[in-house]
């Protein structure tokens, strides 16, 4: 993927030190505050800007690939755009007095160019064939093999942001997403339910018949009873998905209305915040571009390369620049869906979701007929969800464990919140399962605030 | 509160060795990648090395390749850095950090401990 548009920086990851607001030297110039700009935008048709200096005048905005040079003189004029120079670019209609920096693809962590930077869009960094992209953080990604999966068949093969995923021939054991023979299976180590009926075998070759078969006979033994436990679990987990679907899935028509005006906040800063568009602050630049520069005000979820999700090829601009602003966002509560909460002598708080006991909670308190629907809602592939339940094997609460942990992971601390998983619940139709997570979390009686924001 | 406290710095020989140690507390640490990062007298910061939560993927600059092992011990929250073949050119604070987070962002700097001074000279 594009890197952002800090251009100056190579191979050393080395970060000029922005740490006071100083803005990159890779926007070449300043542009106006985006917050301001929407404002002033907002009053034009799509297309047009507001003149800067004068309020009756709309201007028509620069097409991609030029940018702004001169306002329009008055009413009806054209604007004065120039096309960019080269190693600089705008991917989308604008009003910047200066074209973006091109990025440069991050040879360190094995990125190749895809595609060079041209006026209106920028580099597109990638890997090899037969490599996967592993990401360091929302846009910093580096290129590693994909897995051959030698003593052990293709599960999944490998895809752009995932490696292979192997299943082990017998005998063999996944270690690191390899398939390692099962004499190197230690006892501590989590292969000896894998390798067990290797490791007896083992140790009865020197006795009698008897200590080869007993082993052989308790290890079906097991077998057979955790198929009558899963039989079990099965038919529970049916009941008690209809049970779900009555009592969980309708929300008091009270709580609904209540909702009705109640505004979400975006799963994200809103991008409108970043001072300088293109740029991304994270060390030493982003691997995914982000060249679709955007005034919209409006930030929805779709927009945000969130961790879990696929990320697809644009990524928004990062907000650390202005730390006052990060800050103001951080602590601007997002509102809760239960009222009742809002009733309590304790204002509705974000439930720790780096705390293992929440995402059980979660676990225990989404219908298992509705919890495919409901990863995929926060992000998850089905290739992941895939690749989780078999690497979990027969536990189905710990591989939905691993998905909700892969989701908090993946997402940025400030959006991995209960609220989050409240809104999914909420567009799922499931409010009463968010009232039973809380519940379980907090008893009867509130507990005390825990942070809103997870550090 | 998230803490991260580093040790095992000091003042060593070139061609020496140091391992570096980083305990953390306040946040599941076997879910996140961990790296760390240091800043050289007078210069900006750059990532060292970098490990996912299961140790599979590991990331070195390229300074520092055959030289440093990271590793992790997630039982014990702990991140390390064996630090072999000591330069010079490697004395720096290192301080251990999230990889999601960009280095730029001011608050993320309330999280970070004092780091741990390196210092390769004969």
């Known amino acids: 993927m594009g890197l952002s548009t800090v251009p100056d920086l190579l191979l050393p990851l080395v970060l000029l030190e922005l740490l006071v607001g100083i803005y990159p030297s890779g926007v070449i110039g300043l542009v106006p505050h985006l917050g301001d700009r929407e404002k002033r935008d907002s009053v034009c048709p799509q297309g047009k800007y507001i003149h800067p200096q004068n309020n009756s005048i709309c201007c028509t905005k620069c097409h991609k690939g030029t940018y702004l040079y001169n306002d329009c003189p008055g009413p009806g004029q054209d604007t004065d755009c120039r096309e960019c120079e080269s190693g600089s670019f705008t991917a989308s209609e604008n009003h910047l007095r200066h074209c973006l920096s091109c990025s440069k693809c991050r040879k360190e962590m094995g990125q190749v160019e895809i595609s060079s930077c041209t006026v209106d869009r920028d580099t597109v960094c990638g890997c090899r064939k037969n490599q996967y992209r592993h990401y360091w953080s929302e846009n910093l990604f580096q290129c590693f093999n994909c897995s051959l999966c030698l003593n052990g068949t293709v599960h999944l093969s490998c895809q752009e942001k995932q490696n292979t995923v192997c299943t082990c021939h017998a005998g063999f054991f996944l270690r690191e997403n390899e398939c390692v023979s099962c004499s190197n299976c230690k006892k501590s180590l989590e292969c000896t339910k894998l390798c067990l009926p290797q490791i007896e075998n083992v140790k009865g070759t020197e006795d009698s018949g008897t200590t080869v078969l007993l082993p052989l006979v308790i290890f079906f033994g097991l077998c057979l009873l955790s198929l009558l436990f899963i039989g079990l679990m099965y038919r529970y987990q049916r009941w008690k998905s209809k049970l779900y679907s009555i009592v969980c899935g309708k929300s008091t028509p009270e709580k609904e209305g209540e909702l009705e005006g109640t505004t979400t906040k975006p799963l994200a800063p809103n991008p409108s915040f970043s001072p300088t568009p293109g740029f991304t602050p994270t060390l030493g630049f982003s691997p995914v571009p982000s060249s679709t520069f955007t005034s919209s005000s409006t930030y929805t979820p779709g927009d945000c390369p969130n961790f879990a999700a696929p990320r697809r090829e644009v990524a928004p601009p990062y907000q650390g620049a202005d730390p006052i602003l990060a800050t103001a966002l951080a602590s601007d509560p997002i509102p809760n869906p239960l009222q009742k909460w809002e009733d309590s002598a304790h204002k509705p708080q974000s439930l720790d979701t780096d705390d293992p006991a929440t995402l059980y909670a979660v676990v225990e308190n989404v219908p298992p007929l509705r919890w495919k629907e409901f990863v995929r809602r926060l992000g998850l592939s089905d290739h992941e969800i895939d690749r989780l339940e078999l690497q979990n094997g027969r536990c189905l609460r710990e591989a939905q464990y691993s998905m909700l942990a892969t989701w908090r992971r993946r997402t940025p601390r400030r959006e991995a919140t209960l609220e989050l998983l409240g809104r999914v619940l909420r567009d799922m139709d499931l409010l009463g399962c968010l009232e039973d997570i809380e519940e379980a979390l907090c008893g009867p009686a509130a507990l005390p605030p825990a942070p809103s924001l997870l550090r | 509160e998230v803490q991260l406290l580093e040790s095992g710095g000091g003042l060593v020989q070139p061609g020496g060795s140091l391992r570096l140690s980083c305990a953390a507390s306040?946040?599941?640490?076997?879910?996140?990648?961990m790296g760390w990062v240091r800043q050289a007298p007078g210069k900006g910061l750059e990532w060292v090395s970098m490990?996912?939560?299961?140790?599979?993927?590991?990331y070195y600059a390229d300074s520092v390749k055959g030289r440093f092992t990271i590793s992790r011990d997630n039982s014990k929250n702990t991140l390390y850095l064996q630090m072999n073949s000591l330069r010079a050119e490697d004395t720096a604070v290192y301080y251990c950090a999230e990889t999601n987070r960009p280095l730029t962002y001011k608050p993320w700097f309330d999280y970070w401990g004092q780091g741990t001074l390196v210092t390769v000279s004969s």
């Open positions: 306040g946040f599941t640490f076997a879910t996140y990648s």
């Open positions: 490990i996912d939560p299961e140790g599979y993927h590991t």
